[in-house]
Interface confidence: medium
């Protein structure tokens, strides 16, 4: 939005669409330019010309705050924003009033106004900035500190969130978040935010407030986790009835409303948006929680936050699934697909989150539990996140899921088919100021499949011989992943999600290095766990030299801003189940493939699962549907007619530049997993 009084007067513009939506913890540049048609203004022959005066303010419902004022090359910054805001281009470019804001907090949301005054002329432009996302602490239900790094990432993903970055935790801390619980972050460090230090919560900062850190930890160590929920398309709805719902009834009620049980991350976003309910409800992970936005003594102990109902006084255990609460549903188009029976009792993925009370009705909370320590048993709270003063019920019967017996099944033999497996890695354009790897190998090796494999069902046998040419990682495999749409399209957060959705986790630099040492090569820059971007090159060639010139090695671009886009390197460990190949005469559309696997107590295999099965010896010269809509096939023993001369998981792309997913209505074989 821009304003000026008349055509040839001073004019100010912010050439950005409003609102600008930015992630918590990130940095922001708001461009602001002004055109000043006036000659230097003088008030009298003896006085120096008046320079334009630049003023940046932030306007919220409550108040207007001047962030900085600049004139004659001098910038005066409001002391509260001293290390936060700057004018990066002023005074080098006198008409460029672009504002830079570091480490955005939720509190930085508002209308930003760029105002320029020159003599009696005055013009301004505004931009609404919405800082999106919320950091929350997440804990396995069984007990405190039970999540290794991989499970921590999955715990967040299953709750419509991703593992938080240090910048996001810092921003949340500056917004008031306080938690005396050590939790994993995206860079593999373990930290916790403390505003009022006390014994047991001093960490590496003694009695100073701040985010404590244990540094980078071994991925097998176990802690809680800090998750980050960014934004959601749909809405959270409280469903209630006079008699309330058991867990199963709650799930059914949400379905009846065209919705499903909400995740913890979705409830946090709703709470952040203002949701306030003094009645606890079931969530998708079988936890019971309620959001408090308006503090009152008889509802959550006069504290704000998403409160959790625990079974035991030491804040562990789910309420019995037959106990009755409201249903907290989520309606919208961005459902997170969680299998109905995913959160089984005692399973590795049993997860829930912090703090709280037992508020079946609005109850006073008479007794406090001793405040916890960084490795002890609780949490202190400063807005916006939470404390505990739990009153707990008697323990109830534990709950277990009974798996259904599997159905045996058989299928027809393979039939020959023609498709287009991946050529040796040919990638398209994508310009970067530094030499982004671009492999151009001769034309697309579109190879027709032959019908040489007539095995109906192939199961990846655990302990199969090591795959030749495969990185020797203890039981696991590193693979390059790219969504079907385009090369270099994943932000750091999307990269983590992409790996998790495919049944893997984002690889660490050490895992990529080990893969490289075992002969892995890929001329595609991809995110790693530590927010660096790298790619392994065994045989250097022009577009793939990176920072190592003609020497082999893992190239790196160093730590990159999380908003930049690349591919990703994922790591999948051992296969917990089996991948099997299915075909029939007419083959399957993507939708039919989904339904077929489900009808046989299986799911469509993920890319990660197929890689793990390949690692264990699965070899198939037919491309099959996978859960992300991609079409791939695993080759252990290379043969000229089948995927070239190297072992690996081949991908069928729509376009010769190796982008695009196949049409979901096209017909192919299927890889199922169970």
């Amino acid at each position: 939005e821009e304003t000026s009084d008349h055509d040839n007067s001073l004019s100010v513009s912010i050439p950005e669409p409003s609102p600008m939506r930015v992630l918590l913890g990130s940095s922001l540049t708001i461009p602001c330019y002004f055109i000043d048609p006036m000659h230097p203004v003088t008030t009298a022959p003896s006085t120096a010309p008046l320079a334009p005066r630049i003023k940046w303010s932030r306007i919220t419902k409550e108040k207007e705050v001047v962030l900085l004022v600049a004139t004659e090359g001098q910038v005066r910054i409001n002391s509260a924003y001293q290390d936060k805001v700057s004018l990066p281009n002023y005074p080098a470019i006198p008409s460029d009033a672009t504002l830079e804001i570091q480490n955005l907090r939720s509190n930085d949301s508002g209308i930003y106004r760029c105002e320029v005054m020159h003599g009696i002329e005055d013009s301004e432009a505004t931009l609404e900035v919405v800082v999106k996302g919320i950091v929350f602490h997440y804990r396995a239900i069984s007990t405190r500190y039970t999540l290794d790094f991989d499970r921590a990432q999955r715990a967040c993903l299953q709750n419509s969130a991703i593992i938080a970055t240090p910048e996001q935790l810092q921003a949340a801390y500056e917004d008031g978040f306080h938690q005396c619980d050590a939790g994993w972050l995206a860079d593999q460090t373990v930290r916790y935010p403390i505003h009022t230090p006390r014994e047991g919560c001093y960490g590496d900062k003694d009695e100073f407030p701040g985010v404590r850190t244990y540094g980078i930890r071994d991925t097998n160590e176990t802690y809680d986790v800090y998750c980050f929920a960014e934004e959601m398309e749909g809405e959270v709805l409280y469903a209630t009835s006079p008699e309330k719902f058991t867990f199963q009834e709650a799930a059914n009620e949400c379905r009846r409303l065209g919705a499903r049980l909400a995740t913890t991350g979705q409830l946090y976003l709703a709470w952040q948006g203002g949701m306030d309910m003094c009645s606890a409800g079931w969530l998708a992970d079988r936890s019971v929680r309620y959001p408090i936005s308006k503090a009152r003594p008889n509802c959550g102990g006069n504290l704000l936050g998403v409160r959790t109902v625990y079974l035991h006084a030491n804040q562990t255990g789910y309420p019995d699934p037959s106990s009755r609460y409201d249903a907290i549903c989520y309606t919208g188009e961005d459902f997170v697909d969680i299998p109905e029976n995913f959160f089984g009792v005692g399973g590795e993925e049993d997860i829930t989150i912090q703090t709280v009370t037992w508020p079946d009705v609005e109850l006073p909370l008479p007794r406090n539990i001793t405040e916890g320590e960084a490795r002890g048993n609780v949490i202190l709270t400063v807005k916006p996140i939470f404390d505990l003063s739990p009153t707990a019920p008697e323990p109830e019967e534990p709950f277990t899921f009974v798996p259904e017996p599997e159905k045996p099944f058989t299928f027809a033999t393979d039939v020959g088919v023609t498709a287009f497996p991946e050529a040796e890695n040919r990638t398209g354009e994508a310009t970067r100021p530094w030499g982004v790897p671009e492999e151009s190998t001769p034309g697309p090796a579109f190879t027709a499949f032959t019908s040489e494999d007539h095995v109906v069902q192939v199961t990846a046998v655990p302990g199969a011989a090591e795959v030749p040419g495969q990185p020797r990682l203890p039981g696991g495999v590193v693979f390059h992943y790219r969504p079907g749409s385009a090369r270099y399209s994943l932000t750091f957060e999307e990269a983590q999600q992409a790996c998790l959705r495919t049944g893997a986790v984002i690889a660490s630099p050490e895992q990529l290095q080990a893969a490289y040492e075992a002969g892995y090569e890929q001329c595609d820059a991809g995110w790693l766990q530590d927010q660096t971007v790298r790619y392994p090159i065994v045989s250097p060639r022009t577009p793939c030299v990176g920072d190592k010139d003609s020497s082999p090695g893992v190239r790196t671009y160093g730590v990159r801003p999380p908003s930049e886009t690349y591919d990703v390197y994922c790591y999948v460990d051992k296969l917990e189940g089996e991948v099997f190949f299915i075909t029939r005469l007419e083959q399957f559309t993507f939708q039919e493939a989904l339904a077929f696997c489900e009808s046989h107590n299986a799911t469509l295999a993920s890319t990660g699962q197929l890689y793990a099965a390949w690692r264990q010896g699965l070899d198939k010269c037919y491309a099959g549907w996978l859960s992300d809509g991609s079409l791939r096939y695993p080759i252990v023993t290379p043969r000229p007619s089948c995927g070239g001369d190297k072992p690996g998981v081949r991908t069928v792309y729509l376009y010769p530049n190796q982008t695009g997913l196949p049409d979901p209505l096209s017909r192919h074989h299927v890889f199922c997993f169970r």
């Epitope: 398309e233 749909g234 809405e235 959270v236 709805l237 409280y238 709703a270």
Partner: nanobody, 123 residues
């Protein structure tokens, strides 16, 4: 606070079309879920359609599915209701409503309401 002003109502023949607009004041329009409701003479107010803050998710009453389309333009702070194949039973005062995104307690739990615009479907 958000102020809502509806426009575009009028008299239309059965089978005809109308497009209602709802202009919102306030700078945070993009963080609101927007809805259309209607109230026929002597009847209770009923839900017609809603659209999420980004425009990515829409909801419709069964009685208007396939005939009405809700959309929004966040840069213009405006939400629209395109009404096709209008029937006499669509005659009502149409209200625009807004609520903060991300959560609601019932279909009717909107915080801000417009004054309404009259739509008459008659031959």
């Amino acid at each position: 606070d958000v102020q809502l002003v509806e426009s575009g109502g009028g008299l239309v023949q059965p089978g005809g079309s109308l497009r209602l607009s709802c202009a919102a004041s306030g700078r945070t329009f993009s963080t609101y879920t927007m809805g259309w409701f209607r109230q026929a003479p002597g009847k209770e107010r009923e839900f017609v359609a809603a659209i999420s803050w980004s425009g990515g998710t829409t909801y419709y009453a069964d009685s208007v599915k396939g005939r009405f389309t809700i959309s929004r333009d966040n840069s213009k702070n405006t939400v629209y209701l395109q009404m096709n194949s209008l029937r006499p039973e669509d005659t009502a005062v149409y209200y625009c409503a807004a609520r903060p995104r991300y959560y609601y307690y019932s279909l009717y739990s909107y915080d801000y309401w417009g004054q309404g615009t009259l739509v008459t479907v008659s031959s």
